[in-house]
């Protein structure tokens, strides 16, 4: 009794699990134009549908919800919308419309969905660069989820002092204020399907700008260990004669510029040294007093002073009177 | 209580128009399908017009074709025949019936009489 | 167009079986409804998709389908079921189509 007819376009439909997939289905052009009824999909080998408009038919429990049949016969429409697709929806489909009138109904071809692994992963977009101490809003979103599926739950996670934004379907919005330790910690945007039970994230490293907040000075005098000043120091001993080499070292986000001074430099001061290291291969009168080792960063510079006193070889001092 | 109250009916003369109304009372008029039958005086049944739940689908009887229109009003719970070009023949008591598997739900029936 | 035809007449002694059959074409593919009218009253559903009853319907009014003609069969009738009755089907071009009726009298 009954008729068939067969579903236009591909026999089989991927999807990935948590999102959604439209099922195409056209009603047969030979329906007689006073053959009317409802519409229903079925899994295959099932007799209780997955998705009907026929007010007085229940529908299967784990569909329920999920699956729409999207019903529109005027412009001959039957497909069927399912979305938050889960793993066990992998299976054959059919459509069925029936007439209350009519013992026979039209029956479609199958279609098989096949669910797949969820392998998008949520993208983490930043506008600009973060700076330390300065709000910025950083956007986790989803753009291939789609608008009728169940909305996805955002996680953020970060060691940064951070405020939730506003959130769309797709997106969540994080406020972030990043301090200069935060700089190269992760942050991890966290997104569940609660319709399919999955979850996927991604992990971004944090690139913070910020000014130096320490500088310091490594010397080396000849063969001796280094040792390091963290402070600006009043007065270093030096032998005459001995070599010194003088190493800056500051941090900051991208690194300071490194340059030395001899004296307290002015703003537009030339330098002795480009680089934070400053050789002193024979130390004597000429080099007696301060030196000076300034980090100049696009958020802000900072410097440190050190003070050599030149020791006299008794032997010298007196071949020179 | 689920019924169908009925209004609208009438002398009009050959020609002219009337519009039926159906109010639906004690169930979900969004869902179900509605028909308009009619009985001419002495004589038997005689289907009329149908229109689906979601309006997407209407059909009439040869005899009624390009001259009658079914609607509803879903906001008004209301159904519609709206009868235009009127011939002596279309005399009769008109009913709205609901569609379940069958007609299950009569209206009280209206009478239209078309003389001139 | 589609045609279902009733007798017109069927008289039926009280507590006697009255059978009023319906025929037209296809009924292999339709389901049969039938309906009971009173004077001046709306007409009643009394068994659809050929079988079927409602609720309120009394046991004693039962269908059948053969594939050729169908029948409503009233068993043990009584003085109420005096009435006009009607078989109803759909037709695919049609549209929906009444009997021409049987008025079943209770002598």
């Known amino acids: 009794q009954e008729r068939r007819f067969q579903l236009e376009g591909p026999e089989s439909l991927t999807v990935q699990e948590g999102l959604c997939v439209l099922v195409p289905c056209r009603l047969p052009t030979t329906l007689p134009a006073s053959y009317y009824g409802y519409g229903y999909w079925f899994l295959e080998g099932a007799d209780v549908p997955v998705a009907t408009n026929d007010p007085d038919e229940e529908v299967q429990e784990e569909t329920r919800g999920r699956f729409h049949l999207l019903w529109d016969p005027r412009r001959k429409n039957c497909s069927l919308s399912i979305r938050d697709a889960r793993r066990r929806d992998n299976a054959a489909y059919f459509f069925r419309l029936k007439s209350k009138w009519m013992k026979y109904g039209y029956t479609s071809s199958k279609l098989s969905v096949r669910v797949m692994a969820l392998t998008h992963r949520p993208n983490i977009s930043i506008p600009g660069t973060l700076e330390s101490g300065h709000p910025s809003n950083l956007t986790c979103s989803v753009p291939w989820v789609c608008e009728q599926g169940t909305p996805p739950i955002f996680s953020w996670m970060s060691a940064a002092p951070t405020s939730l934004g506003p959130r769309t379907t797709q997106s969540s919005v994080l406020t972030i204020t990043p301090r200069p330790q935060d700089h190269s910690t992760n942050l991890t945007c966290q997104v569940t399907f609660p319709g399919a039970g999955v979850t996927m994230e991604r992990t971004i490293q944090l690139n913070v700008s910020y000014a130096p907040q320490k500088v310091a000075i490594s010397i080396f005098q000849g063969n001796s260990a280094a040792f390091k000043i963290l402070q600006n120091t009043s007065s270093l001993p030096v032998l005459e004669g001995q070599a010194l080499r003088l190493l800056c070292d500051a941090d900051g986000n991208p690194p300071a510029h490194l340059s030395w001074f001899q004296g307290f430099p002015a703003l537009n001061a030339t330098p002795i040294s480009n680089t934070g290291v400053l050789e002193l291969p024979q130390v004597g009168s000429a080099e007696e007093g301060d030196f000076t080792c300034r980090a100049q960063h696009p958020l802000g510079s900072l410097q440190i002073s050190l003070s050599l006193f030149v020791h006299w070889k008794p032997e010298g001092r007196a071949g020179g009177v | 209580e689920v019924q169908l109250v009925q209004s609208g009916g009438g002398v009009v003369q050959p020609g002219r128009s009337l519009t039926l109304s159906c109010a639906a009372f004690?169930?979900?008029?969004?869902?179900?399908?509605m028909h308009w039958v009619r009985q001419a005086p002495g004589k038997g049944l005689e289907w009329v017009a149908v229109?689906?739940?979601?309006?997407?689908?209407?059909y009439y009887a040869d005899s009624v074709k390009g001259r009658f229109t079914i609607s509803r009003d879903i906001s008004k719970n209301t159904l519609y025949l709206q009868m235009n070009s009127l011939r002596t023949e279309d005399t009769a008591v008109y009913y709205c019936?609901?569609?379940?598997?069958?007609?299950?739900?009569w209206g009280q029936g209206t009478m239209v009489t078309v003389s001139s | 167009s589609y045609v279902l035809t009733q007798p017109p007449l069927v008289s039926v002694s009280p507590g006697q079986t009255a059978r009023i059959t319906c025929s037209g074409e296809?009924?292999?593919?339709?389901?049969a409804s039938w309906y009971q009218q009173k004077p001046g009253q709306s007409p009643m559903l009394i068994i659809y998709?050929?079988?079927k009853r409602p609720s309120e319907i009394p046991e004693r009014f039962s269908g059948s389908n053969s594939g050729s003609t169908v029948t409503l069969t009233i068993s043990g009738t009584q003085p109420m079921d005096e009435a006009d009755y009607y078989c109803q089907a759909w037709d695919d071009s049609t549209g929906g189509v009444f009997g021409t009726g049987t008025k079943v009298t209770v002598l």
């Open positions: 296809n009924w292999g593919q339709k389901y």
């Open positions: 004690g169930f979900t008029f969004s869902t179900y399908t």
């Open positions: 019936a609901r569609e379940a598997s069958a007609f299950d739900i």
């Open positions: 229109i689906s739940y979601d309006e997407g689908f209407k």
């Open positions: 998709e050929d079988t």
